[in-house]
Interface confidence: medium
């Protein structure tokens, strides 16, 4: 027999979702008497957050299910349930086991720009020049698809002068020039950048937007006949 069981369930699931099954064996007869009929119950849950009845166990099968909404991996990524198994269909001898329930990450946190406003200076004509690094915070699991940022220039780049990529380690957005900028044509660009995740949001979340004011610096160019 096993003293500790492990299982997992996605955060934010609806009540009724099955998590795992625990089993206790009893050598006594379970056909003609109740001596070998095992009844399961949850004796305690730790931590009791958001409250102490997050899970239920099927009395006869030992299947553990979610009974309340509010599983939040960012707050509690693992629960410890003390399970009691009692023979004689609940009236006999009792043994206890532990079930550790891991709460798996769902993309329930949107990346947020911090800060949301940037000013940058770029010399005209420079191609592939790093303009600005944009920083986001995301409470989902680091380096998971729910955490990795995807950046999109939503507006302000009429001439398709800029591109933005995600730094694989820092998760920052790296804004660079795709084409040379012309000070004489336009000495300031205001870009609007939106950030989402690689993984889709599991619920409707507000999308964070950053504003980047790019000042084009004049470079002394030779006269042209």
């Amino acid at each position: 027999t096993q003293d500790t069981f492990r299982g997992s369930v996605l955060e934010g699931v609806l009540p009724g979702t099955s998590v795992m099954q625990v089993t206790a064996t009893d050598e006594d007869d379970a056909i003609y008497t109740y001596n070998g009929v095992v009844a399961y119950s949850i004796h305690s849950q730790e931590p009791k957050d958001p409250h102490d009845l997050m899970f239920t166990i099927h009395r006869s099968t030992g299947t553990i299910s979610v009974i309340s909404s509010g599983l939040d991996r960012e707050k509690v990524p693992e629960y410890t349930l003390t399970i009691q198994a009692t023979d004689m269909d609940g009236d006999g001898s009792t043994t206890t086991a532990v079930a550790v329930v891991e709460i798996l990450d769902a993309n329930d946190n949107a990346p947020m720009f911090d800060p949301q406003k940037y000013e940058a200076h770029v010399p005209e004509n420079a191609v592939g020049h790093e303009v600005q690094r944009l920083t986001v915070t995301d409470l989902d699991a680091p380096n998971s698809p729910a955490w990795r940022a995807t950046y999109l220039i939503m507006g302000g780049d009429d001439g398709d002068h800029f591109t933005i990529t995600t730094h694989p380690e820092s998760n920052q957005g790296i804004l660079t020039t795709r084409k040379g900028l012309d000070f004489e044509a336009k000495n300031q660009h205001t870009l609007y950048v939106e950030v989402t995740n690689e993984a889709p949001f599991v619920l409707k979340l507000p999308t964070s937007t950053a504003t980047i004011v790019v000042h084009v610096e004049d470079v002394n160019e030779a006269p042209v006949f």
Epitope: Q2, S8, P47, D49, D72, P77, T80, V100, P142, S144
Partner: antibody
């Protein structure tokens, strides 16, 4: 560089409470859980509890009624409070960072530790 | 709670020798879903904080010399130092993170002859 530094009172009278602060740098408390571990003089290590990135906690059930772990993400500080101290609570108290926030990171393993603060319970 | 038992409690070896120490768990630390053993090894030098050497029973932490190797599965685990150096003088602890509360073994003290 990831650093953790504990600061505590040093001496606590029996039956009184203990408050220790762990100040971290080089990483964010919104990205990594923090554990508290203690070590009585000349003895082994005992895990006290953990505070997760979202503020939830798991405690050692043997000490749960006396323990409280909280944090202030903006100040990069984690706080341990322990009530009703007795002489056998005399120990060096460490805060330690979990390897990661996710199970596949091996989050139960602790990759960075503070130097610890010595707490003596004596009248 | 899970009980972790380390042996021997102390041992003395000469520089260059191979050393093995044992850690036994009161129940299996192997999770069938991911086939991982929830066990870590730490080194604590005199007057210092513990340092993580191994996690997942056999994965060496970044920066740890390759003379340190963790092995084993289920309930029986071993830490091996292939060629001991003088700087390895320390107490070595195993720790399970399969179930709460996390628990440590009593430690193995490594002394240099």
């Amino acid at each position: 560089v990831q650093l953790l530094e504990e600061s505590g009172p040093g001496l606590v009278a029996p039956s009184q409470s203990l408050s220790i602060t762990c100040t971290v740098s080089g990483f964010s408390l919104t990205s990594y859980p923090i554990n508290w571990v203690r070590q009585p003089p000349g003895k082994g290590l005992e895990w006290l509890g953990v505070i997760w990135t979202g503020g939830g906690t798991n405690y050692n059930s043997a000490l749960k009624s006396r323990l409280s772990i909280t944090k202030d993400n903006s100040k990069s500080q984690v706080f341990l409070k322990m009530t009703s101290l007795q002489t056998d609570d005399t120990a060096r108290y460490y805060c330690a960072k979990s390897r990661g926030v996710y199970d596949f990171d091996g989050r139960g393993a602790m990759d960075y530790w503070g130097q610890g603060t010595t707490v003596t319970v004596s009248s | 709670e899970l009980v972790m038992t380390q042996s021997p409690s102390s041992l003395a070896v000469s520089v260059g020798e191979k050393v093995t120490m044992s850690c036994k768990s009161s129940q299996s630390l192997l999770y069938s879903s991911n086939q991982k053993n929830y066990l870590a090894w730490y080194q604590q030098k005199p007057g210092q904080s513990p340092k993580l050497l191994i996690y997942w029973a056999s994965t060496r932490e970044s920066g740890v010399p390759d003379r340190f190797t963790g092995s084993g599965s289920g309930t029986d685990f071993t830490l091996t130092i292939s060629s001991v150096k003088a700087e390895d003088l320390a107490v070595y602890y195993c720790q399970q993170y399969y179930s709460y509360p996390y628990t440590f073994g009593g430690g193995t003290k490594l002394e240099i002859k």
